[in-house]
Interface confidence: medium
Amino acid sequence: MAVTACQGLGFVVSLIGIAGIIAATCMDQWSTQDLYNNPVTAVFNYQGLWRSCVRESSGFTECRGYFTLLGLPAMLQAVRALMIVGIVLGAIGLLVSIFALKCIRIGSMEDSAKANMTLTSGIMFIVSGLCAIAGVSVFANMLVTNFWMSTANMYTGMGGMVQTVQTRYTFGAALFVGWVAGGLTLIGGVMMCIACRGLAPEETNYKAVSYHASGHSVAYKPGGFKASTGFGSNTKNKKIYDGGARTEDEVQSYPSKHDYV
């Protein structure tokens, strides 16, 4: 029962996480115009992985896609790649985990097969979550690094669009969605891996016992019994993931002056 609950919860948490990663990837607000000290503006600028937008005070919003690939900063390309890899791995993980769910019976699928599939999907979710967290963190670090390396006359934007000093960008909602979603996917993956431990079959090697009944002889050999509950002696929960999250400011790498924001 506990295994089914852990597996089911892991699946649901991962599902929510992956939905969040997809949402974050599609969102336009990865970096938003910094409104601190400057709450009233005629236009509000924000940028995503795929396009940049301008919202006028009238409510009219105009977005322009980044129609160049070569002109975009390598860091932005890396973030796109990380998010897409995260989504793909997460989607495959979801597909695999559906068939691995204990509550769903597909033909005469062995518990060992379900355990392997659960572990596979768990690992996929963990990697997916890490990809999303890495992607979002790289982007955040890119924004902050750009600010720390900037001077008054060095403000250029995505794809070479020049910005004035007055347009400064800070963390957008998509970054926070991405961090939370990545974390949820990671947690879901860990739960799937824990559930896998409970699903794993344990060979209970009983000695063959012969029962001599009157009239005829029946030999009962229970050696093939599989313990499929999670309460076996070998169900210690191993720590699957012990990654310490670091803040964007602790990343002390100093990349070259890229032309983003």
Epitope: D34, Y36, N37, N38, L143, V144, T145, F147, W148, S150, T151, A152, Y155, T164, V165, Q166, R168, T170, F171, T247, E248, D249, E250, V251, Q252
Partner: antibody
Framework: QVQLVQSGAEVKKPGASVKVSCEAS????????MHWVRQAPGQGLEWMGI????????NYAQKFQGRVTMTRDTSTSTVYMELSSLRSEDTAVYYC??????????????????WGQGTTVTVSS | DIQMTQSPSSLSASVGDRVTITCRAS??????LGWYQQKPGKAPKRLIY???SLQSGVPSRFSGSGSGTEFTLTISSLQPEDFTTYYC?????????FGQGTELEIR
């Protein structure tokens, strides 16, 4: 309350280096930037640079590039400013000043709200 | 670099007077400006942040206004302790720059 306590006055010879310390207390050390500002006798204020105690990133004024090094020690909540190849024009009062920001709102500096008492550095042969 | 031009460089006034100090930025700095007061032999003290917000503990006779390139500090009714030096600081982009200062003296 928030306090910045700087090291004592220094007298140095031209060509030498000086290292001024600034110990912070009364707030979370890594949640604020630290600036260094100097003031030559009878002159105005001059911004030297900024350090982020969380991570150690720095940005220096072009004038001091290559001569100034700002570091921090999170275990003692102390920021250091080292100025090398001293010349007589470096005779000034050196101030550290806190710049409190909120990473969830914006990581941009918001200006110096609390200042140290100042450290007098005299460069004389 | 962004140049901050502060005017006047010195100003004579009497107790109770209303005075205005101006700071002009060489390019737009949004509202990323602070006003500081410095008494002889002391560290500067912030009076105004974000161009127009009063720092806590600062008397209400001090006020700031402006945005973009033009900023003003107004002292509505001068008190004896206000006769000292004032600086503006832009913290919009590196390198941060101060105005050259305004010395306020008793007439």
């Amino acid at each position: 309350q928030v306090q910045l306590v700087q090291s004592g006055a220094e007298v140095k010879k031209p060509g030498a280096s000086v290292k001024v310390s600034c110990e912070a207390s009364g707030y979370t050390f890594t949640s604020s930037y630290m600036h260094w500002v100097r003031q030559a006798p009878g002159q105005g204020l001059e911004w030297m640079g900024i350090i982020n105690p969380s991570g150690g990133r720095t940005n220096y004024a072009q004038k001091f590039q290559g001569r100034v090094t700002m570091t921090r020690d999170t275990s003692t909540s102390t920021v250091y400013m080292e100025l090398s190849s001293l010349r007589s024009e470096d005779t000034a009062v050196y101030y550290c000043a806190r710049d409190h920001y909120d990473i969830f709102t914006t990581y941009y500096p918001r200006g110096m709200d609390v200042w140290g008492q100042g450290t007098t550095v005299t460069v004389s042969s | 670099d962004i140049q901050m031009t502060q005017s006047p460089s010195s100003l004579s006034a009497s107790v109770g007077d209303r005075v205005t100090i101006t700071c002009r930025a060489s390019q737009g700095i949004r509202n990323d400006l602070g006003w500081y007061q410095q008494k002889p032999g002391k560290a500067p003290k912030r009076l105004i942040y974000a161009a127009s917000s009063l720092q806590s503990g600062v008397p209400s006779r001090f006020s700031g206004s402006g945005s973009g390139t033009e900023f003003t500090l107004t002292i509505s009714s001068l008190q004896p302790e206000d006769f000292t030096t004032y600086y503006c600081l832009q913290h919009n982009s590196f390198p941060f720059t101060f105005g050259q200062g305004t010395e306020l003296e008793i007439r």
